[in-house]
Interface confidence: low
């Protein structure tokens, strides 16, 4: 995943926490929160694996890259990063692995330069629809986010709300059309069974979409047509059985696309013929020579590119009277 990188050197350790009722005075330029390491030269603050239960209030105004990984934040409330003056330089925020289970509306408000956000490896049982838009207006002010990393944010089964996890995530992505400028979206390892049909059409700036290691069975109702800037589409390690003509044509029509399809349980029967023909002709699929059949049993491990139409048959459906158990 694309975490904020840092060439941090000369980290300084910190003074004790300020009281939570923050003074109106701006923080001292060399101040560093307790349990954090700071490098003004690298514009980086690292509060990593310190079991913090809330975001430090006294973050230095210069911070551009903030790592709050490996903590125990649990809840990210509205205005969690709101400061006076705002943390106007903060561009990359990594909150991965911090045991967040709830991200509330407006959690990232007052971060006018936030371009990269990583919430991976948090069991997000409750992601507010307005977590990223910060407003419940039908059209919000545009978010500055360019990269949103949401790998492995699915909570354990027993902690999920009584609603579709896919729907909850998509609602946050689409609220207020705030993420129109998003270029990278990573949603790997989230047990997604389907992709709601409207999600991609409303993220027209996407260059990179990672849906690997989910449980997607079909892309029949997903349209890639509007994603004219899409450069990489990761669909490895899903449950895809076949890609149908409409999807193939849409992918072929994207001018810069590279598609990754490894480790899907391809079903090599008569419905696979169009996809095999397409694979033989297309340049967009990376590692296409590695794609192999999983079903039916007689076709297991056959390389898709080596199949011909005679190999791809469907067993005739017998009338009920002739079927055997």
């Amino acid at each position: 995943s694309s975490s904020p990188t840092s060439s941090a050197s000369s980290f300084s350790s910190s003074a004790p926490f300020l009281a939570s009722a923050v003074s109106a005075q701006p923080p001292l330029p060399d101040q560093c929160p307790a349990l954090c390491e700071c490098s003004e030269a690298a514009r980086t603050v690292k509060c990593v694996n310190r079991n913090l239960t809330e975001v430090p209030t006294d973050l230095p105004a210069y911070v551009r890259n903030l790592f709050l990984t490996g903590n125990q934040l649990a809840v990210l409330p509205a205005g969690a990063f709101a400061r006076r003056p705002p943390l106007a330089e903060l561009a990359a925020l990594n909150l991965s692995g911090s045991r967040l289970d709830e991200v509330r509306a407006g959690a990232f408000e007052h971060l006018p330069s936030l371009r990269q956000l990583d919430l991976s490896h948090n069991p997000l049982a409750d992601l507010s629809p307005f977590a990223f838009s910060g407003s419940n207006a039908s059209v919000s002010a545009p978010s500055p986010l360019v990269e949103l990393i949401l790998n492995h944010i699915v909570p354990p089964e027993d902690e999920r709300q009584n609603r579709s996890f896919e729907g909850m995530v998509v609602a946050a992505l689409l609220a207020g059309r705030a993420l129109q400028g998003l270029r990278r979206l990573e949603l790997a390892s989230n047990h997604f069974l389907y992709l709601p049909r409207d999600v991609l059409a409303q993220l027209p700036s996407l260059r990179h979409l990672d849906l690997s290691n989910n449980s997607l069975v079909s892309l029949t109702y997903v349209s890639f047509r509007n994603l004219t800037h899409l450069e990489s589409l990761h669909l490895e390690d899903n449950a895809l059985k076949v890609l149908h003509n409409g999807t193939l044509a849409e992918l072929q029509g994207l001018p810069h696309i590279r598609v990754f399809l490894d480790n899907n349980p391809w079903v090599c029967d008569c419905h696979m013929a169009d996809m095999v023909t397409w694979l033989k002709e297309t340049e967009v699929v990376q590692g296409k020579d590695r794609l192999t059949c999983a079903y039916p049993e007689k076709m297991r491990n056959r390389v898709l590119l080596e199949l011909n139409s005679a190999d791809l048959d469907c067993d005739p459906i017998l009338p009920p009277s002739l079927q055997t158990s």
Partner: antibody, heavy 117, light 108 residues
């Protein structure tokens, strides 16, 4: 429908205290910053303090720090302003206002505080 | 503190006039955090324009905002009877949050 309703205003003598309340409804209280703003008769708007109901962040106008205390009760969806050592110049209409990146989008109707002997 | 200075402090205009109100900040304000409000006598202020140039919900398109840094402008392209009110600019950037002194728009 979002509603903010202030109460607790009235006549108080100089040096006295008053506690204003703001009852919020129609939205998730812990999702928005909320402020107190006051307006003296015939004058402009003056920001007093703000609080992020979902966290512990509080900001004061230094002018009021020490005399005024902002607080909230999330269970009651309520915001408070405790005002001590009141002076004649604190006479004003006090508004609570819901905020966010996009300004104060909802205001209460205001409650009048009169400090006079 | 960031001082917000509005000019003029009052103006008289007729229905249909184009009206411009300026707001000057004593130091630079991030344009995301510069807002305008309208207030009528005896009423609470109402958000008019947020983040320098975005119309708040339900605000007519004759209102517009512009500016950056320290200089911001509110324009009413064609004044209507219901627009006679006091207008305030507001910086939501640096504590203490501050408002301009107000511009009262009166009927000529």
């Amino acid at each position: 429908e979002v509603q903010l309703v202030e109460s607790g205003g009235g006549l108080v003598q100089p040096g006295g205290s008053l506690r204003l309340s703001c009852a919020a409804s129609g939205y998730t209280f812990t999702d928005y910053v909320i402020s107190w703003v006051r307006q003296a008769p015939g004058k402009g708007l003056e920001w007093v303090a703000e609080i992020y109901p979902g966290s512990n962040s509080i900001y004061y106008n230094e002018k009021f720090k020490g005399r005024f205390t902002i607080s909230r009760d999330n269970a009651k969806n309520s915001l408070y302003l405790q005002m001590n050592s009141l002076r004649a110049e604190d006479t004003a209409v006090y508004y609570c206002a819901r905020g966010g990146n996009y300004g104060f989008d909802y205001w209460g109707q205001g409650t009048l505080v009169t400090v006079s002997s | 503190d960031i001082q917000m200075t509005q000019s003029p402090s009052s103006l008289s205009a007729s229905v249909g006039d184009r009206v411009t109100i300026t707001c000057t900040a004593s130091s630079s304000v991030n344009s995301n955090y510069l807002h305008w409000y309208q207030q009528k006598p005896g009423k609470a202020p109402k958000l008019l324009i947020y983040s320098t140039s975005n119309l708040a919900s339900g605000v007519p398109s004759r209102f517009s905002g512009s500016g950056s840094g320290t200089d911001f402008t509110l324009t009413i392209s064609s004044l209507q009877p219901e627009d006679f009110a006091t207008y305030y600019c507001h910086q939501y950037h640096r504590s203490p949050l501050t408002f301009g002194g107000g511009t009262k728009v009166e009927i000529k």
